[in-house]
């Protein structure tokens, strides 16, 4: 491959190593768990007042929850921090895809059943858009036990 492409890969690799994608994983897991819980009850009934102080001082969020997440400050804060992390990949769509793939791989063992995996994948694809960022055009989020060709 061409030199610049190799340099791009190295830059992406180091960017991925520095990134903290945990808030994205937490945000998505909470989101799909809430969506499962919300069958049979009002999906917008708040489980926590976004302005009430919680035990963790870092969760006192001055914002009302985003339109995508009206159910409590904890997850709203995970979403903001996740979006900050993804914002760093905004100018490198291929690397953004790698970040999304990494989130999928990190959480694949925790997903229970095909339905939850599909739901997680769907939410993951929507994540850049929810952050107000451009989503990668083609991004394979399939996880195979024997590894996979990413492109």
């Amino acid at each position: 491959r061409q030199q610049w492409e190799l340099q791009g890969d190295r830059r992406c690799q180091s960017q991925l190593e520095r990134a903290n994608l945990r808030p994205c994983e937490q945000h998505l897991m909470q989101k799909i768990q809430r969506d499962e819980d919300s069958y049979g009850r009002d999906p917008y009934s708040p489980s926590q007042d976004p302005y009430s102080p919680s035990q963790d001082p870092d969760r006192r969020d001055p914002y009302s929850p985003s339109p995508y997440d009206r159910r409590g400050a904890g997850s709203s804060q995970h979403q903001e921090r996740c979006c900050n992390e993804l914002n760093e990949f905004e100018n490198n769509q291929r690397c953004m895809c790698e970040a999304l793939q990494q989130i999928m791989e990190n959480q694949s063992d925790r997903l229970q059943g095909r339905q939850q995996e599909q739901q997680f994948k769907r939410e993951l694809r929507n994540l850049p858009q929810q952050c107000g960022l451009r989503a990668p055009q083609r991004c394979d989020l399939e996880v195979e036990s024997g590894g996979r060709d990413r492109y």
């Epitope: 001082p57 870092d58 001055p62 979403q79 921090r81 992390e85």
Partner: antibody, heavy 122, light 110 residues
Framework: QVQLQESGPGLVKPSETLSLTCTVS????????WTWIRQPAGKGLEWIGR???????NYNPSLKSRVTMSVDTSKNQFSLHLTSVTAADTAVYYC????????????????WGRGTRVTVSS | QTVVTQEPSISVSPGGTVTLTCGLS?????????PSWYQQIPGQAPRTLIY???TRSSGVPDRFSGSILGNKAALTITGAQADDECDYYC??????????FGGGTKLTVL
Amino acid sequence: QVQLQESGPGLVKPSETLSLTCTVSGGSISSYYWTWIRQPAGKGLEWIGRIFTTGSTNYNPSLKSRVTMSVDTSKNQFSLHLTSVTAADTAVYYCARLRRVVPTAIWHFDLWGRGTRVTVSS
Amino acid sequence: QTVVTQEPSISVSPGGTVTLTCGLSSGAVSTSYFPSWYQQIPGQAPRTLIYGTNTRSSGVPDRFSGSILGNKAALTITGAQADDECDYYCVLYMDSGVMVFGGGTKLTVL
């Protein structure tokens, strides 16, 4: 409650490097943007630059050649280094958190330190 | 380099209404600059009043409102009070993550 505290020498000699540290307490520094802002006595505020916890930075173009910012997530701290200082760099230096309102690109400073006064003089 | 302009000083009578503006040396200010407004009492750190053109920060009285007026961002204070007397700064968000402060407006409540 998340609090910010600036620290560093109050007096720096001309041509030397000004170094300040901002310590974040009561919450995590991780996955947020952090900034430095300064204010010379009796004058307005000037944005110096921002740093993300991965270490990526954006600087004020007029200061870019002299500014370096760094972050130490293990200590919950981020730092400012300003080289070749002159009397014009005498100011109160503030650190602040920069928030982004998801899913927009609306940014604003929501938390500020109290500021630390730095005088450049021989 | 981009210069963000504000009235150096402005005065208002107690109970009156005043509008502070924030312009650009070249071109018009629009919502895409995500203007925000900060209040600074002498000797203190600034505090956020308005962000994203017109969203009031938590705990800010509704006497403070933000908007775009013509080609400038504007901060309007209605029912001005003695303790509104201080400095006000606007900030515009430029490309590449750069933010620029206006020169500030000193508000006097006469």
